[in-house]
């Protein structure tokens, strides 16, 4: 059997007066009862109607009734002021049944042919209601064959009576410190058969205050207290209400942090309801008094639970809790009316005693020992041997608590050793090897560690030397015994330094020529600069103008002398620079391989020989006087030469330092 709705059997048919279409007889009475299925009604209309006309249809008539109600009493052919004929009218039963009664009296003045009518059952549209009648459904009405059903808007649920829409108005929780709540649909009429529960739930310590606003209209009764619809307010302390009628209830100060509002409505009435504006209060905290040199924000008339304030200090003052600094301070009012943190102080910023400046000193300008905001100090370097690097040495205690230079630097100035100072003011004539006097070559460094070599002090913690002189110690820097500040090689009176790291030029290949024969030694501590220990200067860009062919440089060291022994006393020799092509040619012939002299080398010495550096001098500096700055600078590093030092026609070969300035600067800045 097919599934689906079971349709009722069709109900339709024809009715006619007895004898139709002939004339009807006198004294006739005929009754028809028509019944349609539930949810249906009967429709009836006449295709023919011809009955005797009488006042109020007293004689002959057709009467239509549905239940106890007479729908129409019909006679005649056409309607008059007091009688009705059906004409083209259609008649509908009020329910599912229709009674039709035909009657004729004892006489007719002329023959009448009676009536013919047709009927059929049709669906009742229960959703259509006559004006002034109550609607079938509260919200939405849906008609269907044989019946109807109701549905509700969102936020409502259909009551068990299947017609009323009850509001879904329970379980709302308000947690803000203030807000508004109202009856459903306010200010339109509230729904029927509803039970609404609203909760205000604030943090412990708050007290809810309720104010009824705008209008109040809840169904009431003249004698009984709120029997129909009512509003009740419940706290953990007491119950308020019930409320109904048209008078706004007074303010309710609940003295509670939780409030339950209940609103119940019945099935009748048309009232606009209520609106509540709620606020809250709490025990106020003591008014915060700003500390000296500080201010409170925000400024409020009073501060209650959860309210907060922050303290901001004036420029030059800082938040302190005792000795401990704070970046920010915010206090929160607690439920017991106390602040959760004590008030800090706004203390004048104190930059503290300035750090000691290595090789320098500091002077208090503002006043002895004054280190607070805007105080001024002056750093200076030890005269003669140190100079301050790009800094005027003036520092101010700024609001951030740091001593800050005029350029905004927070780091200490740097006292750089003055380089290139020597007791010798000029390069003399070309002599044989001479004994150095104190202060002549204060950059001279003696390097012991397997062999004797030399180097030159750069700044106060670097030594420039030849790569071949320290190659064996490149992985064991601590094995290098570095001495300075002495003239005598074997003297016990010297300044000891130790190596932290050895940096050999990456282009140097040991036992394969002397190209890139340059190395740097980083000392593990800075040395103190004085007249006997002073760094050599690195060449300026313009230095080549003091290193042309025949310009005189000075080499110094404890290397082999003409007698074939290491010198006991520091020796030096003034020698001229040799034309590069001439030097290259001198080392083209055997036993020297071609290309021994590269562009990274310079040569110095006499064609006649006799004046040269020798083994043991390796790594030492070939220095020149910069006549513009009157400072000595390193132009070459003792690297290699002929088998026999000072040989005629051969020259000493030196690493050309000016080619390595970027390499030196990179190593020193990186390490």
């Amino acid at each position: 059997t097919p599934l689906g709705p079971k349709w009722p059997e069709p109900v339709f048919g024809r009715l006619a007066s007895p004898g139709f279409p002939g004339e009807y007889a006198n004294d006739q009475e005929r009754r028809w009862t028509l019944t349609a299925p539930p949810g249906y009604r009967l429709r009836l209309y006449f295709t023919h109607f011809d009955l005797e006309l009488s006042h109020l249809c007293e004689y002959d008539f057709v009467k239509l009734s549905s239940g106890a109600k007479v729908l129409a009493t019909l006679c005649g052919q056409e309607s008059t002021d007091t009688e009705r004929a059906p004409g083209k009218d259609t008649f509908y039963s009020l329910g599912s049944s229709l009674d039709i009664t035909f009657r004729s009296d004892y006489s007719n003045e002329k023959p009448f042919t009676g009536f013919e009518a047709f009927y059929a059952a049709e669906d009742i549209d229960e959703c259509q209601v006559a004006p002034g009648e109550a609607p079938t459904c509260d919200h939405h009405c849906h008609n269907h064959l044989g019946g109807f059903y109701c549905s509700c808007r969102a936020g409502y649920v259909l009551h068990r009576n299947k017609r009323t829409c009850s509001a879904l108005c329970s379980g709302q929780v308000f947690t803000q410190r203030s807000g508004e709540l109202s009856s459903p649909e306010y200010p339109r009429p509230y729904p029927k058969l509803s039970s609404c529960t609203y909760s205000i739930s604030l943090e412990e310590g708050f007290s809810v205050i309720l104010d009824f606003v705008e209008s109040f209209d809840v169904e009431t009764h003249p004698e009984t207290l709120c029997p129909y619809d009512f509003l009740k307010i419940q706290t953990d302390r007491e119950e308020h209400g019930p409320f109904c009628g048209k008078t706004l209830p007074h303010r309710i100060e609940t003295k509670s942090n939780t409030v339950t509002i209940t609103f119940v409505t019945d099935e009748s009435g048309d009232h606009t309801g209520w609106k509540i504006h709620y606020t809250s209060t709490a025990q106020p905290c003591p008014y915060p008094m700003a500390p000296p040199n500080g201010h409170v924000s925000p400024v409020q008339a009073k501060y209650i639970l959860k309210d907060s304030f922050s303290i901001f200090c004036e420029t030059g003052y800082e938040l302190l809790q005792g000795h401990l600094p704070l970046k920010s301070f915010t206090a929160v009012c607690q439920k017991d009316g106390s602040w959760d943190r004590p008030m800090p102080a706004c203390s004048i910023v104190d930059c503290g005693p300035p750090d000691d400046l290595p090789s320098g000193r500091v002077e208090y300008i503002t006043g002895p020992g004054v280190t607070t905001y805007k105080a001024v100090i002056q750093y200076s370097c030890e005269e003669t041997f140190y100079t301050m690097k790009v800094n005027d040495g003036k520092y101010v205690c700024e609001a951030d608590g740091f001593w800050t230079s005029s350029k905004g630097e927070k780091s200490l100035p740097v006292c750089e050793p003055v380089c290139g100072l020597s007791a010798r003011t000029t390069g003399g004539q070309i002599y044989g090897g001479q004994k150095a006097k104190p202060g002549d070559f204060p950059w001279q460094v003696l390097i012991l560690g397997g062999t004797t070599a030399a180097g030159a002090l750069l700044y106060d913690n670097w030594v420039l030397t030849a790569a071949h002189a320290v190659y064996e110690q490149k992985h064991d820097a601590s094995a290098l015994d570095i001495r300075m500040g002495t003239l005598k090689r074997l003297s016990p009176h010297y300044t000891q330094a130790w190596s932290e790291a050895v940096f050999i030029h990456e282009g140097y290949t040991h036992d394969a020529g002397f190209d890139n024969d340059i190395a740097l030694i980083k000392l593990n501590n800075k040395v103190v600069i004085n007249s006997n220990i002073t760094p050599i200067c690195l060449p300026r860009k313009e230095a080549e103008s003091f290193m042309r062919t025949d310009d005189i440089g000075t080499a110094s060291g404890w290397g082999l002398t003409q007698r074939g022994f290491l010198a006991r006393n520091l020796m030096y020799v003034d020698i001229p620079i040799v034309d590069h092509q001439k030097c290259t040619a001198a080392y083209e012939k055997p036993p020297y391989p071609r290309g021994s002299v590269t562009a990274n080398m310079l040569c110095a010495g006499l064609e006649s020989g006799g004046k040269d550096s020798c083994r043991g001098d390796s790594g030492g500096a070939l220095v020149f006087l910069d006549s513009e700055t009157e400072r000595w600078f390193v132009g070459g590093i003792v690297s290699w030469g002929s088998m026999n030092c000072g040989e005629a026609g051969q020259y000493g070969v030196y690493t050309k330092v000016i080619n390595y300035i970027p390499w030196i600067e990179n190593i020193i800045s990186d390490f």
Epitope: Q321, G322, L324, P325, K327, G401
Partner: antibody, heavy 114, light 107 residues
């Protein structure tokens, strides 16, 4: 949740430098507060060594000023302690803490011995 | 430096009883005093700051009072987990200093 964790060698030779690091999680050391180093020699009371503040300023116990350095690495949210020229008297449990002690590390024992 | 002197050095109390610990500062430290609890092998645990402010999570039985030079930590009803060493700490001025501690033991 704020957590502090000390790390570093548990044994240091006399005259060498003691180095410890405190790694902070759950709070940025530049956001606020002072970040302390505190130590407790065996059976003795706590001794505050110094702090580095949110801004990088330092404050040291005058009794240690010539030997102590506190620094920080903001990229790693760490602050460090260096104590030079140590002796047996520097043997202690070393703690890092925040401000007036609302959070502490679990402590690390450093023994100074040859 | 400011010396913080705690008394007594040892306090013997029965569980449920009240314990009152004293701390005296050699100079005025305002209310810049904190109290800590330390158990063997553990780092200190902060209880009170600014003399009387209890840290969140610290039971209400712990309370602090005092200002200037005299400070008190009170444990209203000792629980078994409260037996430990208690330190006071001033952070008013450099150097920050700690008291020698009071050991609270079971009577």
């Amino acid at each position: 949740q704020v957590q502090l964790q000390e790390s570093g060698p548990g044994l240091v030779k006399p005259s060498e430098t003691l180095s410890l690091t405190c790694t902070v999680s759950g709070y940025s050391i530049t956001s606020d507060y002072a970040w302390n180093w505190i130590r407790q020699p065996p059976g003795k009371k706590l001794e505050w060594m110094g702090y580095i503040s949110y801004s990088g300023r330092t404050s040291y116990n005058p009794s240690l000023k010539s030997r102590i350095t506190i620094s920080r690495d903001t990229s790693k949210n760490q602050f460090s302690l260096k104590l030079s020229s140590v002796t047996a008297a520097d043997t202690a449990v070393y703690y890092c803490s925040r401000h007036y002690g609302d959070y502490w590390g679990q402590g690390t024992l450093v023994t100074v011995s040859s | 430096e400011i010396v913080m002197t705690q008394s007594p050095a040892t306090l013997s109390v029965s569980p449920g009883e009240r314990a009152t610990l004293s701390c005296k500062a050699s100079q005025n430290v305002g209310t810049n005093v904190a109290w800590y609890q330390q158990k063997p092998g553990q780092s200190p645990r902060a209880l009170i700051y600014s003399a009387s402010y209890r840290y969140s999570g610290i039971p209400a039985r712990f309370s602090g009072s005092g200002s200037g030079t005299e400070f008190t930590l009170t444990i209203s009803s000792l629980q078994s987990e409260d037996f430990a060493v208690y330190f006071c700490h001033q952070y008013n001025s450099n150097p920050l200093t700690f008291g020698g501690g009071t050991k609270v033991e079971i009577k």
